[in-house]
């Protein structure tokens, strides 16, 4: 019996076609991806082969300004409108609390939304009773497949689940149900989910019974043969792993951005064991057309986007000094304001010991393409904010030791003068620099406001300690030359939009004004 | 309130071109779909296209593809529909029609009568 | 593309009593995101530009008299006005609003027997 698995994950809001680094489509011949685009390549397979799933290993949530005016009602409708089977939790489902994800997504889905390691508690337990579940059998044709579902246990660190939802470990909590779908004569089983492809491969490794692994949270590109785009492989697709009980179970994730629909075909023997898999990503690129009728329903959408594009967000009662000549050579308040907006978003009190988990910001001046003045009535609106990061990106949470930091602070300085990037915006960091000195021997003192603390205080930078740290997606990949982050990050979790960001603490704080404090001094 | 106001009639030689314009006024222009829909003398109504002025995006019906342009000036909210090698067949009122929310033509311009006659 | 097949072709009702038109659409118009159907009738009178009177096949635009009703799902719809009017004496027209490119029926004429 054969069975088609089509996967998505991180699609991240990139409900519209996007360019081909997934930020947005400007020359629409080259642009790839989009529901509407993806629905003509499902239902050209659903067509052509019977025994079809579509699954979604989470984070449909964040990323564009689609999530920040629909609030996940988007994210509803159009994979309602695509037909998916199945939607594992991602942290970010998390992103505007349990209610908003209850309201618009898991009350609206009409397909199954899995999490068997996401446990709630008190009040919150009778309210969504039933909205998630740990799996669910799902009929195929003549036979039955069962899913299930698991998320990050690291979500309380990365999104806002609240204090009423328990993350189990995920081995933990899946083998009892694997184990149940067994008592329930479910011999095919495929468990899909959102903690990244190190635990994607421990799943097929140490749950008993697991078929497939389809995951997500680690964007992680698998392909077979030469890669039909710019992502390099991580490894084959699919990626086999040797189970403890010595099975071959097939590991598959499908990048992110929707920029490549997943395809795994898996032959299963009467008993319900794998005896072949293959496939590959396929490429969503303008080969494929645009299906008119989503595409007409996203077109329909899309006009309440730029309505908020031009609404206002919050006032600066200050001048906001994006200027390359200041941002680039010395600390600009607009960089204080994006710093100190990555640490407000990041503010999770998960332990008494700790104010927070994180304190530091480090932010490449080059990324600041803007300023905004504040002579037009103070006015800050989306449309501002995406002329100052226009890019995309993401703001992500990584752990890197104080070494690894103390080398990025360097190359920030390395070639000092040029108006180049790489020099450092910062946040809960105050840097000195002594450009008399040679390159990679500039930064004099670094010291780190602490987190492990009632009252927080700035202590130097020890270089053997472990350090949490908000900065963009472009440097955590290594971008601007820091190529010591990319190669010595200890772990590296994907963040909130950019934009995003900035513009919910725009409008929390009302009225601004950031300052030039300090954080950055030259001897 | 929402107003569409369209351009004069027209009359048009066969194989010459005819540029309509709509100045829209009363919301954002840039934030709204405009298409642009004709109807033949005692005939039915036939889609053309549209445009989403904000950034330019546009949709055109295969019918007309490659004879119609449709741009959009934002400086003065003005949406224009050009049709080129005219014939007498494309005699017609052409009307632009603002989208909503909820439906593609519920604010309609008075229409511009285009006569293509030797 | 979506064919839209309007009947009948013309129609004529006396004053007070119901007047029905039918719309048949070539593929299904529903919107499987929503459950809801993209159909919209309009009304045009000689010299005007037509004028929304229902949309999402059942839901009459704002300022349009409760005597006008829109029914159906899938492939057939139907425009009901409960007592006709003079003033309803026009075209009508039914709008395909689901998919590229947009399509119109042909039209019925509504006439006061």
């Known amino acids: 019996w054969e069975l088609t698995i089509l996967h998505t994950n991180d699609v991240h809001s990139r409900l519209e076609q996007t360019s081909e680094d997934s930020s947005k489509c400007v020359n629409a011949s080259r642009c790839m991806g989009g529901v509407a685009r993806l629905f003509t390549k499902v239902q050209q397979i659903r067509r052509a082969e019977p025994n079809v799933l579509l699954l979604d290993a989470g984070d449909q949530y964040q990323g564009t300004i689609w999530f920040t005016v629909y609030k996940g009602a988007e994210v509803a409708h159009f994979m309602n409108a695509l037909r998916y089977d199945a939607m594992a939790l991602g942290n970010h489902e998390f992103d505007n609390g349990v209610e908003g994800l209850i309201e618009p997504l898991l009350k609206e889905a009409k397909f199954p939304i899995l999490s068997a390691n996401i446990k709630a508690k008190g009040p919150l337990a009778s309210q969504i009773s039933g909205l998630y579940l740990p799996y669910k059998v799902l009929p195929v044709g003549d036979e039955v497949v069962g899913i299930v579902g698991y998320t990050s246990k690291e979500t309380p660190f990365l999104s806002n689940p609240g204090t009423n939802l328990v993350f189990e470990d995920e081995i933990t909590a899946l083998q009892p149900e694997v184990d149940k779908l067994k008592t329930l004569n479910v011999n095919k089983i495929i468990a899909l989910g959102h903690s990244g492809f190190e635990m994607d491969k421990l799943i097929a490794q140490k749950v008993r019974g697991v078929d497939v692994v389809v995951g997500g949270h680690s964007n992680t590109f698998l392909y077979t043969g030469n890669p039909p785009s710019k992502e390099v492989p991580a490894g084959k697709y699919p990626f086999i792993v040797t189970s403890d009980d010595g099975r071959k179970v097939p590991v598959v994730q499908a990048y992110a951005f929707g920029k490549y629909l997943g395809y795994l075909k898996i032959e299963f023997d009467e008993r319900g064991n794998v005896i072949s898999s293959h496939g590959n990503p396929i490429l969503l690129n303008s080969s494929i057309p645009e299906d008119p009728s989503i595409k007409a329903d996203i077109n329909k959408w899309r006009i309440k986007l730029d309505n908020y594009s031009t609404q206002e967000l919050g006032k600066t009662i200050v001048y906001l000094d994006g200027s390359s000549q200041s941002c680039r050579f010395r600390e600009c308040n607009m960089g204080n304001l994006i710093c100190d907006a990555m640490i407000n978003n990041n503010l999770r009190h998960t332990d008494e010991m700790f104010w927070n988990h994180v304190s530091m910001c480090i932010l490449n001046g080059g990324g600041i393409r803007s300023p905004i003045d504040e002579r037009n009535n103070g006015t800050i609106t989306w449309e501002n904010l995406a002329a100052v990061l226009p890019f995309g990106g993401t703001f992500d949470l990584v752990q890197l030791k104080g070494s690894t930091l103390k080398k990025a602070f360097e190359h920030s300085v390395h070639r000092y003068g040029q108006s180049t990037g790489e020099f450092l915006q910062v946040g809960g960091i105050h840097v000195v620099y002594d450009l008399s000195r040679k390159p990679g021997d500039r930064v004099v003192k670094l010291d780190v406001l602490c987190t492990k603390c009632r009252v927080p205080s700035y202590d130097p930078l020890k270089m053997d300690e472990v350090y949490k740290v908000i900065l963009p997606n472009f440097l955590a990949n290594g971008g601007d030359g820091f190529q010591m982050i990319k190669d010595e990050l200890l772990r590296h979790d994907s963040g909130d939009q950019d934009i995003n960001v900035v513009s919910t603490y725009i409008s929390k704080m009302k009225v601004i004004y950031p300052a030039v404090e300090g954080r950055i001094k030259f001897s | 309130q929402v107003q569409l106001v369209q351009s004069g009639a027209e009359v048009k030689k066969p194989g010459s071109s005819v540029k309509v314009s709509c100045k829209a006024s009363?919301?954002?222009?840039?934030?709204?779909?405009i298409s642009w829909v004709r109807q033949a003398p005692g005939q039915g109504l036939e889609w053309m296209g549209q445009i989403f002025p904000g950034d330019g995006d546009i949709n055109y019906a295969q019918k007309f593809q490659g004879r119609v342009t449709i741009t959009a000036d934002k400086s003065t909210s003005t949406a224009y529909m050009e049709l080129s090698s005219l014939r007498s067949e494309d005699t017609a009122v052409y009307y632009c029609?603002?989208?909503?929310?909820?439906?593609?033509?519920?604010?309609w311009g008075q229409g511009t009568l285009v006569t293509v006659s030797s | 593309d979506i064919v839209m097949t309007q009947s009948p072709d013309s129609l004529a009702v006396s004053l007070g009593e119901r007047a029905t038109i039918n719309c048949k659409s070539s593929?299904?118009?529903?919107?499987?995101?929503?459950?809801?159907?993209?159909l919209a009738w309009f009304q045009q009178k000689p010299g005007q530009p037509p004028k929304l009177l229902i949309y999402?096949?059942?839901t009459r635009e704002s300022g349009v008299p409760d005597r006008f009703s829109g029914s159906g799902s899938g492939t057939d719809f139907t425009l009901t006005i409960s007592s006709l009017q003079a003033e309803d004496v026009a075209v009508y027209y039914c709008?395909?609003?689901?998919?590229?490119?947009?399509?119109f029926g042909q039209g019925t004429k509504l006439e006061i027997k």
């Open positions: 999402g096949a059942s």
């Open positions: 029609a603002r989208m909503d929310f909820y439906s593609w033509f519920p604010y």
């Open positions: 593929q299904s118009l529903l919107n499987s995101g929503n459950q809801k159907n993209d």
């Open positions: 009363g919301y954002a222009f840039r934030s709204y779909w």
């Open positions: 709008q395909n609003d689901h998919s590229y490119p947009l399509t």
